[in-house]
């Protein structure tokens, strides 16, 4: 597995010697066009850690989830926040640290013996109970290998895109997540405006395939903001 390779004592493929400093903090890096990082001292910490702006949990580290930093705050600013430990309050699975999941608003341990039953129960849960159902598992690798022995075909229930066969991604469908086709050139795609609206999509689309990006359709440039159609287009 990924973790066993990373944690093994195998000598990694090291680069040729670098000609200077290891990091380049001075390099300007953009998260996405037109997105500004939260500035000032508001999110700065003593070690100059700058939070990472995000639109979904999958973009964050394995021990993080994506949310607004202030409770009930500006939905337009979402950053990667540290996951919540056992017995802490939660609203969805992704908020809980690896090895835990969200049950009745509290992070609880993913006991291996009943975990699969919980997953199946979660898939059939009503929308009002847990808005994101399987979101958290898209990035929790702890137990997923026990559940998926073969790559899922189109329509198979999944936890993350790596559970799906080539050419498919794991996307929300009603209140579970299933393998759907990666979008081809000309197909309609979803361009998130990073306002948190992705969390409400119950029919989530896959991303655009290799060499394609989600852009406004040429003849829709003049249309009003709300009716702009995005399609997968060549870079």
């Amino acid at each position: 597995t990924l973790n066993s390779v990373l944690n093994s004592n195998a000598i990694k493929n090291l680069p040729p010697p670098l000609g200077g400093a290891a990091g380049h903090p001075g390099s300007a890096v953009s998260a996405a066009p037109g997105i500004l990082y939260p500035g000032g001292n508001k999110y700065q910490t003593i070690d100059n850690y700058q939070p990472y702006p995000c639109a979904e949990d999958e973009e964050c580290g394995t021990d993080e989830y994506c949310a607004s930093p202030t409770r009930g705050g500006d939905a337009g600013v979402q950053i990667c926040l540290a996951c919540r430990k056992r017995r802490k309050r939660c609203m969805r699975h992704a908020m809980c640290c690896p090895g835990n999941y969200c049950k009745n608003g509290i992070c609880v341990s993913s006991d291996q013996n009943h975990f699969r039953g919980e997953i199946e129960e979660t898939i059939t849960e009503s929308f009002g109970n847990d808005h994101s159902t399987l979101d958290g598992y898209s990035r929790r690798t702890t137990l997923s290998s026990k559940m998926y022995h073969t790559k899922g075909q189109e329509g198979s229930v999944c936890l993350r895109s790596s559970d799906c066969a080539s050419g498919l991604c794991c996307a929300r469908h009603f209140w579970s997540k299933i393998c759907k086709p990666v979008l081809k050139e000309g197909q309609v795609c979803t361009k998130h405006r990073r306002k948190g609206s992705h969390g409400l999509e119950i029919f989530q689309r896959c991303y655009c395939g290799e060499g394609l990006s989600c852009r406004i359709q040429k003849d829709h440039h003049q249309a009003s903001n709300s009716s702009r159609l995005h399609t997968c287009q060549r870079h």
Epitope: L2, G23, V29, A32, T62
Partner: nanobody, 129 residues
Framework: EVQLVESGGGLVQAGDSLTLSCTAS????????MGWFRQAPGKEREFVAA????????HYADYVKGRFAISRDNAKNTVLLQMSSLKPEDTAVYYC??????????????????????WGQGTQVTVSS
């Protein structure tokens, strides 16, 4: 054995385009960020572009923004760097690298050389004026 192999380098004229390719073998890299760095003679290795594990996020250094585009195909374990409007100052050895998804991520994660565990041997790009 894990290997990253770059290809596509060469000698081009200023203003031309070039596409570099990086093929990974020995493991799957779908939970890794893939990046391109470059090193000109007598200079430090510098960040060029990166694409995250989630495929939806790309990152570019200011000096290549709008000219270079990074993409990846997890099924084929390949990463592409499409370079256009090349300048003489883009001349360097270009390295492909892979950084594991961290527990915590910060703005500078993708541009920090030391976060990358696996590196290719590099491909030379020379842009003549």
């Amino acid at each position: 054995e894990v290997q990253l192999v770059e290809s596509g380098g060469g000698l081009v004229q200023a203003g031309d385009s070039l596409t570099l390719s990086c093929t990974a073998s020995g493991r799957t890299f779908d939970n890794y960020a893939m990046g391109w760095f470059r090193q000109a003679p007598g200079k430090e290795r510098e960040f060029v572009a990166a694409i995250s594990w989630s495929l939806s996020r790309t990152h570019y250094a200011d000096y290549v923004k709008g000219r270079f585009a990074i993409s990846r195909d997890n099924a084929k374990n390949t990463v592409l760097l499409q370079m256009s409007s090349l300048k003489p100052e883009d001349t360097a050895v270009y390295y492909c690298a892979a950084a594991p998804r961290p527990k915590r991520i910060s703005v500078s994660y993708f541009s920090t050389t030391s976060n990358y565990d696996y590196w290719g041997q590099g491909t030379q790009v020379t842009v003549s004026s």
